[in-house]
């Protein structure tokens, strides 16, 4: 019995279906086919779980969280024992193993391993200003999304005719911050943060209004 090499890892957007491949070759009939799919969740590597089983010509549910979402892609028994997972969740991320036994065919590699990563687009980021908006001050524009896998990068832009930040601005795309030094009237305007990762983007807007000093009345 020989389980074929798997593609290594699969990425899928949250909520979308995933197909985890597992095929094998055997010299025996499929009368005594046993298949166990297991997962080692990334969130809890010490706690492997059963996903689905095929034993004695019957299918059995694995862990409750997979109930109604998991099944074999084809009619069993078969040499293609790939499974689908519908409505993928973040907690489905992990390392999946298919363990195949088909007596009397023993020996060879009877385990296939596939990694599953469930991706999440950035949630709507939160934009805020840190520091005084008085002329001549330094301000920091902050941007962060609560969700996003892979971790989003953040790009700040000024929504004016130049399509870019002023040269006095320093941007950190990982932290989502922009420091604008010595703000002037030219710094005023709408700024947009674009949070993006491999599967999506999300934006927020911030209106920076630089405050000019009020003329003092000398009485």
């Amino acid at each position: 019995l020989e389980v074929s090499e798997s593609p290594g890892s699969i990425q899928v957007a949250r909520g979308q279906p995933a197909v985890l491949p597992c095929t094998f070759t055997t010299s025996a009939a499929l009368i005594n086919l046993n298949v166990i799919w297991m997962v080692t969740p990334l969130s809890n590597a010490n706690q492997p779980e059963q996903v689905i089983l095929y034993q004695g010509g019957q299918m059995f549910d694995g862990a409750p969280r997979f109930h109604g979402r998991v099944g074999f892609t084809g009619t069993m028994p078969a040499t293609n024992v790939s499974i689908f997972i519908n409505n993928t969740q973040l907690s489905d991320t992990g390392t999946y193993q298919c363990l195949v036994n088909n007596l009397p065919d023993i020996g060879g590699r009877n385990i296939g391993v596939t990694g599953l990563t469930v991706l999440v687009p950035p949630s709507a980021p939160h934009c805020q200003i840190q520091g005084s908006q008085d002329i001549g001050s330094d301000v920091i524009l902050l941007c962060s999304s609560e969700e996003g896998i892979p971790r989003p990068t953040y790009l700040w832009e000024k929504l004016d005719n130049t399509l870019k930040l002023p040269p006095t601005a320093t941007q950190d795309q990982v932290q989502g911050t922009v420091t604008i030094r010595n703000i002037s009237a030219l710094s005023s305007g709408l700024y947009q943060c674009v949070a993006s990762n491999a599967i999506g983007t999300s934006t927020c807007l911030l209106d920076l209004q630089v405050i000019s000093p009020q003329p003092r009345n000398i009485g």
Epitope: T162, L165, P166, Q171, V194
Partner: antibody, heavy 121, light 108 residues
């Protein structure tokens, strides 16, 4: 080395399509707004299209609006120009250009070598 | 026709000073910054001046820029043979960038 390298030019019939690419290297591509600028044989420079660092904002010259699409893939450090419904008057050398981060205004501080697009039957 | 207007050609002898004008409107030069480019034959343009009067590193101080109202001017002093090239002004307006038609500088 900081550079821009255009590709994808060639001969195309009127009404046809072409996709130009501009591969950037040596700088943080996503931090810069980028533009396409063209130059017809023996003529002056004409700005074609611009795109912000994130790709979220795009501008077009009236002469290409509705026919050309600018885009970028920051993961590949590449700028694109999809040109549809090409006309004879689109024949030109097409340059990609980087907008300076040192300037408050628009200033193209880095240019590619250009790629020739010829629209002819 | 270009949105920004430049003289088609100017000429001067080596060592002399020359100016190139660029005329626009309130929707471009009047309310925004101007850049200038030099294009030698068969090469890509090169940035000479940005933000009206600033020079990128490596550009000699023989080159200068100024702006007044809706017009801008490029000045070149101490003309050299290698300055013979096409010169372009550039500005921007609402969701668009604009170039001048270009000026051919001949060093006599």
């Amino acid at each position: 080395e900081v550079q821009l390298l255009e590709s994808g030019g060639g001969l195309v019939q009127p009404g046809g399509s072409l996709r130009l690419s501009c591969a950037a290297s040596g700088f943080t591509f996503s931090s810069y707004a980028m533009s396409w600028v063209r130059q017809a044989p023996g003529k002056g420079l004409e700005w074609v299209s611009a795109i912000s660092g994130s790709g979220g904002s795009t501008y077009y010259a009236d002469s290409v609006k509705g026919r050309f699409t600018i885009s970028r893939d920051n993961s590949k450090n590449t700028l694109y120009l999809q040109m549809n419904s090409l006309r004879a008057e689109d024949t030109a050398v097409y340059y990609c250009a980087r907008d300076s981060r040192d300037a408050y205004g628009v200033a193209f501080d880095l240019w590619g070598q250009g790629t020739m697009v010829t629209v002819s039957s | 026709a270009s949105v920004l207007t430049q003289p088609p050609s100017v000429s001067a002898a080596p060592g002399q000073k020359v100016t190139i004008s660029c005329s626009g409107s309130s929707s471009n030069i009047g309310n925004n910054y101007v850049s200038w480019y030099q294009q030698l034959p068969g090469t890509a343009p090169k940035l000479l001046i940005y933000d009206n009067n600033k020079r990128p590193s490596g550009i000699p101080d023989r080159f200068s820029g100024s702006k007044s109202g809706t017009s801008a001017t490029l000045g070149i002093t101490g003309l050299q043979a290698e300055d013979e090239a096409d010169y372009y002004c550039q500005s921007y307006g609402h969701r668009s960038f604009v170039f001048g038609g270009g000026t051919k500088l001949t060093v006599l």
